[in-house]
Each structure stands twice: as structure tokens, then as C-alpha cells.
């Protein structure tokens, strides 16, 4: 069945922590992604950005998690209104920003 929201959020946080702690070389060879507004619909928006990164084993599990948590189909090149379209950042920074926001949501009990 569907993953409970609190479990999904906790697992995603754990994976992002794992990525940031195990990072040696530049994450995803320094690939750049669109920054997103960390608001409602965040899982889908994050996936829309990260799905454009390919061949990066370090974020494959994150992509799988976001794909499972986003209720609609997302394909490469797709953009929602949640993207800050004029701002590209490195995947490493994207992961850090997302992690900080998810931790805040978890502390506040906002699981959806």
C-alpha cells in the first residue's frame, strides 16, 4: 500500500543525510538543477528538477522515493510553477536545501 506520510518524510530525510555525509567528489559531477520553492507540492517539484539529472548513482534512491511520493507522472523537461526558473544550483546545494526544509517540516509535524 501507500507509504504513510511520516514514514515517507523520515526515509527521505535519512537518504538525504546519507548523501550529504558520504559526499566525496562533487555530487553528480557538479550537475546543475533548477531551484524550487519549498512549498506545497514539493515532492513533485523536487522530482521535476532532479529527474533531469541522469547517470548519478548517488541520487538514484532519492529519485525513486520522490517518484513514489509524487502522485502524478513526471518526465524530464517538465516544469511546475514551483520552479524558480531563473535560478540553477548544484545538485549538492539542492540536496542540502531540501534536507533543511524537510527537517523543519518533520519537527513541525507537517507530513503531507
Amino acid at each position: 500500500g501507500p507509504v504513510p506520510p511520516s514514514t515517507a518524510l523520515r526515509e527521505l530525510i535519512e537518504e538525504l543525510v546519507n548523501i550529504t555525509q558520504n559526499q566525496k567528489a562533487p555530487l553528480c559531477n557538479g550537475s546543475m538543477v533548477w531551484s524550487i520553492n519549498l512549498t506545497a507540492g514539493m515532492y513533485c517539484a523536487a522530482l521535476e528538477s532532479l529527474i533531469n539529472v541522469s547517470g548519478c548513482s548517488a541520487i538514484e534512491k532519492t529519485q525513486r522515493m520522490l517518484s513514489g511520493f509524487c502522485p502524478h507522472k513526471v518526465s524530464a523537461g517538465q516544469f511546475s510553477s514551483l520552479h524558480v526558473r531563473d535560478t540553477k544550483i548544484e545538485v549538492a546545494q539542492f540536496v542540502k536545501d531540501l534536507l533543511l526544509h524537510l527537517k523543519k517540516l518533520f519537527r513541525e509535524g507537517q507530513f503531507n
Epitope: 501507500p2 507509504v3 567528489a25 553528480c28 559531477n29 550537475s31 532532479l50 529527474i51 533531469n52 539529472v53 541522469s54 547517470g55 548519478c56 548513482s57 548517488a58 538514484e60 529519485q63 525513486r64 522515493m65 517518484s67 513514489g68 511520493f69 524530464a76
Partner: antibody, heavy 118, light 111 residues
């Protein structure tokens, strides 16, 4: 245009080693995953292993001890090396590039035929 | 490794009829609500061609007569109606775990 082309020795002696090169164009190996797949004559497909854009390498468990995959991104080449060859390693060897997530094998080379025989 | 078993090994279907190919996995290929099962078509003398990804998503340019379904361990590729150019061998493939695997293949003959 995405292209992959395999080149190999054609004939290898039993007990010897095999080196195949996959030369790619139309994309960069720094952000693409390349798989190696083989197909014995008249038989099915067998996944051998892969190298990710960020350098991670995964191997099929059954062949892990005999396989080595590497790449030279600056030359747009991926390499497959196999040791202790047997006659049942005779096959067409393909390299295939994953598409974006969910990483299915979207682009394929035409394959190179390898015969293991004395 | 996850073992994929395809059935039947071969089948003959009349032009315009439905062809159904099954793929059974030795363990679940689902991860976070998605099924990491893909389908390929291989014609004689050619490399494989991706048809369907994530169990049911049609690859760009693939005719709508091809469809995929299933989850966890049981998957189906359906071709309806079958055309003459569909004569080929079809393979399922999983990447739910790091070590990917293919099914043994199903050869489709058009009557």
C-alpha cells in the same frame, strides 16, 4: 544524435581474456550510465554490468569475479574486460545507454560478435 | 539476483488478434510504489528496443497497441491488435536492485 559502437577482437582462445570498447557520441559519459549486455547465438539477453556517470560500477553476481568495467570519459569510451574465457562466452556483446530516470536501457549499439574457440 | 521467468517461451498469434506475454519475478520489483520492470522488443539481427518502462509507461514513438500492466511480481505485456511487424522476441527486465536481470524471452510468431 546518440550513437554507441562496440569494437572487439572477434576471435579469442579459451582461457584468454577479452577486451571490448564502446565508443559513444552525441552525449557525455560524465552524466550517462552505460550497460554491457550479451546474447549467445540463438539465446536470450544477459546483463553483465554497468558503469554510472559518476563512476559507480555494478556487476552481475555470476560474473563479478571475471569482469572489469571502466571508462575514459574524455575519449567517450567505455571498456569491458573479461578473463578466463570459455566457449560459452561466445556471444554478441552490446553496450547500451540508460535513459533518464527510471534508467531503462534506451539506446543500444549494434553489437560486436565474439567467438571463443581454439 | 532477481530471477525473471517469462511465459510462454513462444507463441503464435493470428494477425489482428491479441498477444499476451507474462513475466514473473522471484521477488517484488516494486520500490516506493513504482514497479521497476521494463519491456523490450528484439527483431532478428537487431539490438533490443525499449517498449515500456515502469511496467506500464509507453516509450515515446511506440505504437499504442503495446501496453504493459502488473505490479510486485506479476507483469504482462499485451499487443492488441497484433501486426505483421510485431514478429520478434520480447524480454522483460528489472532494475529494482543494483544487479539487473532479463527474462528468458518470448518469441512471437504471426500466423
Amino acid at each position: 544524435e546518440v550513437q554507441l559502437k562496440e569494437s572487439g577482437p572477434g576471435l579469442v582462445a579459451p582461457g584468454g581474456s577479452l577486451s571490448i570498447t564502446c565508443t559513444v557520441s552525441g552525449f557525455s559519459l560524465t552524466d550517462s550510465s552505460i550497460n554491457w549486455v550479451r546474447q549467445p547465438p540463438g539465446k536470450g539477453l544477459e546483463w553483465l554490468g554497468m558503469i554510472w556517470g559518476d563512476g559507480r560500477i555494478d556487476y552481475a553476481d555470476a560474473l563479478k569475479s571475471r569482469l572489469s568495467i571502466s571508462k575514459d570519459s574524455s575519449k567517450s569510451q567505455v571498456f569491458l574486460e573479461m578473463t578466463s574465457l570459455r566457449t560459452d562466452d561466445t556471444a554478441t556483446y552490446y553496450c547500451a545507454r540508460d535513459g533518464r530516470f527510471p534508467y531503462a536501457m534506451k539506446f543500444w549499439g549494434q553489437g560486436t560478435s565474439v567467438t571463443v574457440s581454439s | 539476483d532477481i530471477v525473471l521467468t517469462q511465459s510462454p517461451a513462444s507463441l503464435a498469434v493470428s494477425l489482428g488478434q491479441r498477444a499476451t506475454i507474462s513475466c514473473r519475478a522471484s521477488e517484488s520489483v516494486d520500490s516506493y510504489g513504482q514497479s521497476y520492470m521494463h519491456w523490450y522488443q528484439q527483431k532478428a539481427g537487431q539490438p533490443p528496443k525499449l517498449l515500456i518502462y515502469l511496467a506500464s509507461n509507453l516509450e515515446s514513438g511506440v505504437p499504442a497497441r503495446f501496453s504493459g500492466s502488473g505490479s510486485r511480481t506479476d507483469f504482462t505485456l499485451t499487443i492488441d491488435p497484433v501486426q505483421a511487424e510485431d514478429a520478434a522476441t520480447y524480454y522483460c527486465q528489472q532494475n529494482a536492485e543494483d544487479s539487473r536481470t532479463f527474462g528468458g524471452g518470448t518469441k512471437l510468431e504471426i500466423k
